[in-house]
Amino acid sequence: LEETLLNTKLETADLKWVTFPQVDGQWEELSGLDEEQHSVRTYEVCDVQRAPGQAHWLRTGWVPRRGAVHVYATLRFTMLECLSLPRAGRSCKETFTVFYYESDADTATALTPAWMENPYIKVDTVAAEHLTRKRPGAEATGKVNVKTLRLGPLSKAGFYLAFQDQGACMALLSLHLFYKKCAQLTVNLTRFPETVPRELVVPVAGSCVVDAVPAPGPSPSLYCREDGQWAEQPVTGCSCAPGFEAAEGNTKCRACAQGTFKPLSGEGSCQPCPANSHSNTIGSAVCQCRVGYFRARTDPRGAPCTTPPSAPRSVVSRLNGSSLHLEWSAPLESGGREDLTYALRCRECRPGGSCAPCGGDLTFDPGPRDLVEPWVVVRGLRPDFTYTFEVTALNGVSSLATGPVPFEPVNVTTDREVPPAVSDIRVTRSSPSSLSLAWAVPRAPSGAVLDYEVKYHEKGAEGPSSVRFLKTSENRAELRGLKRGASYLVQVRARSEAGYGPFGQEHHSQTQLDESEGWREQLA
């Protein structure tokens, strides 16, 4: 990038530069035409017959250097070929010399600084590449010369440029004074400011563009070269912040559009919002879950939003005494998650009707919650109780949802408790044809014993037709019509309101062989 300090092509008024000495044949300001046929201010000198060693000087106005250390001067000039000038003497030249003089203010006068090398600093002696020639009978032909010179290093506030002619016939068509600077550059989302090089190469620190953050590692820098070019080198730059993606050739960060998001800083583009989420604003780092949908704390920011599952289905119960086996089907809606578990809540109602949460005497296998399989075995049920089990399905976002958790209920009522088995049967009297039996009254938990059932058959006669039954309301019974001297197997069960209890162990009794023996008490 070039920053112009002076461009005579753009000047509309007279330049009024200073010449020395004030004599005929001196540099003269004239109007000229440039390539676009625009009128420009030029300086011409053509004193080809001067005395040897006599010089004509032309000095520009004072030019502030504006921080430039090296300034470039592009000269456009024409020069006549000495050979084409019949009256040119040996002093005719096809070169001129360029000088500069530094000062902190516009202090030069018509006579100072002295018109000589030192105090003026010589830049170069400029030779024409193209000479304007005239041959007899033909028009003059020529081309414009373009020469760029480098001044510096400069340290004072400004400078003058001076041209010394020692016998050329030439015109200075334009003078362009400029310095080079590295243009503002944005690369890898890093902005490097416009920089005027003070040395051969200057390190320049970069800053992240809007909505970008520094990448890990050393802060980004580039080198600005003296020629106004950035030195090519890889830039560890910046990356777009969450909610922004690189755009326009990695020169700016663009906010993610509505409906898209970018969760992390770094490379990568905005992605559409995952399932069941949305972003209503631009620049979203995360998409908000729809009402009723959630992300678990452990879910990545880019994960879809999920919802608690629906209730389990079709709970089936199988009661076996004080044990209950429950199993169910998975919910219709898993909520979009894999981490499905089940839990049970339990209430029990006593026969009298009062209800409460189940007591600690129940055991659940494998447990009451965090079940991964759709079944459980409940043990320790009490008889004649009604149990309500609520089976719920849970997942990783169930804890985030408000409102009731859907469940599938099942009611189970246990049987009332029947009397225990009757044992301790005693033979109180026996005869050849009868046996009198007695037993202890069993402790019936659910009410008194209403009656008993005695079951007996002759030993060895096992068929159903040989079994006989006798009901008695007392805890004794007399078996009649028995065979003489025969062995009998006897069992008794008690009945309460809950029903019959189990038959007790078989009791072995024997009738008398003859009457003379009389009644004989036998103990079981």
Epitope: E28, L30, E44, L85, G137
Partner: antibody, heavy 126, light 107 residues
Amino acid sequence: QVQLVQSGAEVKKPGSSVKVSCKASGGTFSTYAISWVRQAPGQGLEWMGRIIPIFGTANYAQKFQGRVTITADESTSTAYMELSSLRSEDTAVYYCARSSYTILTTYYNYNAMDNWGQGTLVTVSS
Amino acid sequence: DIQMTQSPSSLSASVGDRVTITCRASQNINNFLNWYQQKPGKAPKLLIYGSSILQSGVPSRFSGSGSGTDFTLTISSLQPEDFAVYYCHQVSDTSDTFGQGTKVEIK
């Protein structure tokens, strides 16, 4: 602003010569083109020739070749046009005209004439 | 020499009229063509050079166009001071030539 001042009117006999001068005042002279143009009474403009003083040599219109000589004196900033073998049809106003730009200060062409002398009437009559 | 032919040789027009004068070269002269205005008893005045470049100080109602062999001078709105003779002038060759002139008169 440059001025071109021409010499006074001349009355000449047929077969004689006339030399008209054109003095430029103010600044550079050597690198401008000086043209000579004549205009017979009631007629149009007729270009005769041109000189760029620094080069010394002139270009002439074919019609006047051999009869006209254009010269310049850089030391006095004066151009001259001499026409010989005068005939009555050479009766005209003779103008000198300077180009708009010097040979060194235009990319385009230095032959457009923006400065004219006041004209010199040359009458050829026996 | 290159021949320059102007047309018309004269024209009558009123103040405010748009006037067009043409000039044809006998061979290609690129854009090396100038236009002059001359009033009676006066030296010519340069109006346009390089076919279309307006000389400094010349009113903008004057314009020129063309390249090669066909050229035009246009006065967009004729003013009283514009009644004069107009000449084209080619400078492409080592030998210049003028057109024969166009006289613009008051109608």
